[in-house]
């Protein structure tokens, strides 16, 4: 009886790490806010994957702001995050690449990718939207970078840094710069509004990248995509500040707000947040 057989193949939770490497707010850019105080705070930089110092103006800003380095590390870095870097440097896959795909206990029909240890490839699966495990990537590219072997036996990490197989050094990858202004907020801010597959009518906001504004839409309650916010303020905070201006070698741009110019160091070049 096949039903009986399947009861003996329950996928157990042995040593499964939590789903998310960090909280969603850890991915927010450092935001000094509109006020003029000079307060030393810490934020998690998703590009360097480290907690770094920044100057906070004393009001507004976002949740990616911590009083101490320790608090920042506690909230935004986990052993798993360190393990990604460590194991990549050792040319090994992180442990979670070997976990079976886990849709989680919710059912939101979200397309995600996992590393299939049988086929040695990243494959698509339907994620339910909550819980699950860390073998769960938003893009095929990210999954491949972290869990698949590169063509020459090296691994590639997911922030544009390649591990050189010869001398184990981290080499920045060149990036094409098509224009002076680029969108460097979360990629989902560029996706269209997606109602999802359920039957609810929840009031949500999405970022309309064509007009550059947050607009309301009706969310079905499950599925959809990540361009989906419970408030206009949250939408603006996540997506509106994503437009940046690239300047060659350490130049500064003037911002509309009269206060010190603050550089935000990201990856391998200096970029500056354009206030909008």
């Amino acid at each position: 009886d096949s039903e009986e057989d399947e009861e003996h193949t329950i996928i157990t939770d042995t040593e499964l790490p939590p789903l998310k490497l960090m909280h969603s707010f850890c991915a927010f850019k450092a935001d000094d806010g509109p006020c003029k105080a000079i307060m030393k705070r810490f934020f998690f930089n998703i590009f360097t994957r480290q907690c770094e110092e920044f100057i906070y103006g004393g009001c507004e800003g976002n949740q990616n702001r911590f009083e101490s380095l320790e608090e920042c590390k506690k909230m935004c870095t986990r052993d798993n995050a360190n393990r990604i870097i460590k194991t990549t440097l050792q040319q090994e896959k992180p442990d979670f690449c070997f976990l079976e795909e886990d849709p989680g206990i919710c059912r939101g029909y979200i397309t995600r990718y996992f590393y299939n240890n049988q086929t040695k490839q990243c494959e698509r699966f339907k994620y339910g939207g909550c819980l699950g495990n860390m073998n769960n990537f938003e893009t095929l590219e990210e999954c491949k970078n972290i869990c698949e072997d590169g063509p020459n036996g090296f691994q590639v990490d997911n922030y544009g840094t390649q591990l050189n197989a010869v001398n184990n050094s981290l080499t920045p990858q060149s990036t094409k710069v098509p224009s002076l202004f680029e969108f460097h907020g979360p990629s989902w801010c560029l996706t269209p509004a997606d109602r999802g597959l359920c039957r609810a009518n929840e009031n949500r906001f999405y970022y309309n990248s064509v007009i550059g504004k947050c607009r309301p839409f009706k969310y079905s309650g499950c599925g959809g995509n990540e361009n989906n916010f419970t408030s206009k303020q949250e939408c603006l905070r996540a997506c509106k500040k994503g437009f940046i201006q690239r300047i060659s070698k350490g130049g500064l741009i003037k911002t509309k707000r009269k206060r010190k110019k603050q550089r935000v160091k990201i990856a391998y070049e200096e970029i500056f947040v354009k206030n909008m």
């Epitope: 996928i11 939590p18 707010f25 939207g129 909550c130 499950c222």
Partner: antibody, heavy 123, light 112 residues
């Protein structure tokens, strides 16, 4: 209307195994739009989630670390029920045990609960 | 584990008056596509818990509209616009951002 009917002994001796069953009517234990859980409640610890099982392309389970080495939750598809086994019990395991359905579709939450079974661990 | 802390632990109320219960999580419960991984339950005396609010702010079926949930990040609130006698019991918040699923310690609402 989903109903969960719990059964099992109310008294278990220390070091023995606590076994409870939750019979489901109005839904299927194999449903891909539900997950099935055990939760206990005691004055000292409040509501404590113990574990959950669910079937999607295959069966999955997750357990609380606090009981992980002692717990097993199994589905019984032929009887449309699921069970809890907790080994090597101590008086600290004395609690009201609830089975609950996690609604996986629109309403993400424990939307149906069993009536609760008071289990006392005592010699 | 994510720790859920409720306040107050006891709330004496007057029928017809509003009531508010706070729940604070040790980590943020907002997922990236706007869903808040927090539910509210009510356990009436001698009964099993029942789902009141799911995903932070959505009323479960059959729940009167005097109940509302709000909040984001780590701070959440359950409000009863006008308390009725049948609303007495213990209210719990619960997170499902990460395993293990955890509940608050409960807020006991009783009539003055």
């Amino acid at each position: 209307q989903v109903q969960l009917q719990q059964s099992g002994p109310g008294l278990v001796k220390p070091s023995q195994t606590l076994s409870l069953t939750c019979a489901i009517s109005g839904d299927s234990v194999s449903s891909d739009s539900a997950a099935w859980s055990w939760i206990r409640q005691s004055p000292g610890r409040g509501l404590e989630w113990l574990g959950i099982i669910y079937k999607r392309s295959k069966w999955y389970n997750r357990y609380a670390v606090s009981v992980k080495s002692r717990i097993t939750i199994n589905p019984d598809t032929s009887k449309n029920q699921f069970s809890l086994q907790l080994n090597s019990v101590t008086p600290e395991d004395t609690a009201v045990y609830y089975c609950a359905r996690w609604h996986s579709d629109k309403m993400w939450g424990f939307d149906d609960w069993g009536q609760g079974t008071l289990v006392t661990v005592s010699s | 584990d994510i720790v859920m802390t409720q306040s107050p632990l006891s709330l004496p109320v007057t029928p017809g008056e509003p009531a508010s219960i706070s729940c604070r999580s040790s980590q943020s419960l907002v997922f990236s596509f706007g869903t808040t991984f927090l539910n509210w339950y009510l356990q009436k005396p001698g009964q099993s818990p029942q789902l009141l609010i799911y995903k932070g702010s959505n009323r479960a079926s059959g729940v009167p509209d005097r109940f509302s949930g709000s909040g984001s990040g780590t701070d959440f609130t359950l409000k009863i616009s006008r308390v009725e006698a049948e609303d007495v019991g213990v209210y719990y918040c619960q997170q499902y951002d990460s395993y293990p699923l955890t509940f608050g310690q409960g807020t006991k609402v009783e009539i003055k």
